[in-house]
């Protein structure tokens, strides 16, 4: 994750008291919440591995970087960070590994400067479509988010309540077109089987997209055409078998792109010919010399760049009358 780490050397720590105590008064400028460490010089508050069950109410107004990792938050309600006066400086919020399973509509409202949000390593079974947009309007006010880190947010399979997890995440990314300014999106390690076809077209500012360590089998219906700013596309450790001509042409047409394709089970048959030709010519694939065949068995571990058209054959399909059991 690219969330900032504090360079603060002078953290003040408050005396511990009930972590979920609610303060009716606005916080004093130099106040530090219970079970947290604060550095006004670094504009940083760290409430890390303290088993907090709610977001502290008395966060100092100066906070720019807020770490709430390794807690027991469970739920982020609407306005979880809304304060009077607002946390107008908060730019980076890290909530990773805090056992969140529910993020409600408007959870991040009233954070006008929030640029980086990390929700990784939380089993988000219930992510509201309006978690990031804050409203159910067809077009919402633009979110200030530039980086959204959602690695390993998939709940256990038996906890997905018969809903498409991919669909739930994408609904939150697209609601109200609020994330038009998003530049980095990380969705690694989420067991994604597919990428809904409309998602990338509606995130036109993306520079970095990480889809590594998922279960993507195909990119046939995914269009990269509009992502003219895309600089890195991580597709390592998926279940990709081949990239077809349309995808190859779109990737080649992106002016700044670097693509990462390692550790996919490439099927080296006649359908792979176009991809092999493209790999030999393109400069966009990083570590292309490491790509190897997984299937068929006779081709296992062959390097894609070393294949020629004679290597890439498809077994003829016998008519039913000639097939033997």
């Amino acid at each position: 994750s690219s969330s900032p780490t504090s360079s603060a050397s002078s953290f003040s720590s408050s005396a511990p008291f009930l972590a979920s105590a609610v303060s009716a008064q606005p916080p004093l400028p130099d106040q530090c919440p219970a079970l947290c460490e604060c550095s006004e010089a670094a504009r940083t508050v760290k409430c890390v591995n303290r088993n907090l069950t709610e977001v502290p109410t008395d966060l100092p107004a100066y906070v720019r970087n807020l770490f709430l990792t390794g807690n027991q938050l469970a739920v982020l309600p609407a306005g979880a960070f809304a304060r009077r006066p607002p946390l107008a400086e908060l730019a980076a919020l890290n909530l990773s590994g805090s056992r969140l399973d529910e993020v409600r509509a408007g959870a991040f409202e009233h954070l006008p400067s929030l640029r980086q949000l990390d929700l990784s390593h939380n089993p988000l079974a219930d992510l509201s479509p309006f978690a990031f947009s804050g409203s159910n309007a067809s077009v919402s006010a633009p979110s200030p988010l530039v980086e959204l880190i959602l690695n390993h947010i998939v709940p256990p399979e038996d906890e997905r309540q018969n809903r498409s997890f991919e669909g739930m995440v994408v609904a939150a990314l697209l609601a109200g077109r609020a994330l038009q300014g998003l530049r980095r999106l990380e969705l690694a390690s989420n067991h994604f089987l597919y990428l809904p076809r409309d998602v990338l077209a509606q995130l036109p500012s993306l520079r970095h997209l990480d889809l590594s360590n998922n279960s993507l089998v195909s990119l046939t219906y995914v269009s990269f055409r509009n992502l003219t700013h895309l600089e890195s596309l991580h597709l390592e450790d998926n279940a990709l078998k081949v990239l077809h001509n349309g995808t190859l042409a779109e990737l080649q047409g992106l002016p700044h792109i670097r693509v990462f394709l390692d550790n996919n089970p490439w099927v080296c048959d006649c359908h792979m010919a176009d991809m092999v030709t493209w790999l030999k010519e393109t400069e966009v694939v990083q570590g292309k010399d490491r790509l190897t065949c997984a299937y068929p068995e006779k081709m296992r571990n062959r390097v894609l760049l070393e294949l020629n058209s004679a290597d890439l054959d498809c077994d003829p399909i016998l008519p039913p009358s000639l097939q033997t059991s």
Partner: nanobody
């Protein structure tokens, strides 16, 4: 409506341990949190501990932190309360509850068991 059945109560000496169980008749998908409350004679029912079915987040009232541990077995639709270093003031009827919220209030929970009595005395 979910049926919640508590078991495991009994009499124990100060410093001893007990494990309470709460079995749900079915997995209450509409209830995201399972909790234990207790009610001592002549006192109000008070929150003890809670756990989330999915994320496994836990929370405790201050007086039991470090002594009690709440856990769950999703496959068995069962929640447990391991109680150690028991004190006389832990004597109460212990109730299992299920609800939507991540709260400590009685009103956060819609489904309740009948309770199991825990008595701590020399």
């Amino acid at each position: 409506e979910v049926q919640l059945v508590e078991s495991g109560g009994g009499e124990v000496q100060p410093g001893g341990s007990l494990r309470l169980s709460c079995a749900a008749s079915r997995r209450p998908f509409s209830s995201k949190t399972m909790a234990w409350f207790r009610q001592a004679p002549g006192k109000e029912r008070e929150f003890v501990a809670a756990v989330r079915w999915i994320g496994g987040a836990t929370r405790y009232t201050d007086s039991v932190k470090g002594r009690f541990s709440i856990s769950k077995d999703n496959a068995k639709n069962t929640v447990y309360l391991q109680m150690s270093s028991l004190r006389a003031e832990d004597t109460a009827v212990y109730y299992c509850a299920a609800g939507q919220a991540w709260g400590t209030k009685f009103t956060d929970y819609s489904d309740w068991g009948q309770g199991t009595l825990v008595t701590v005395k020399p």
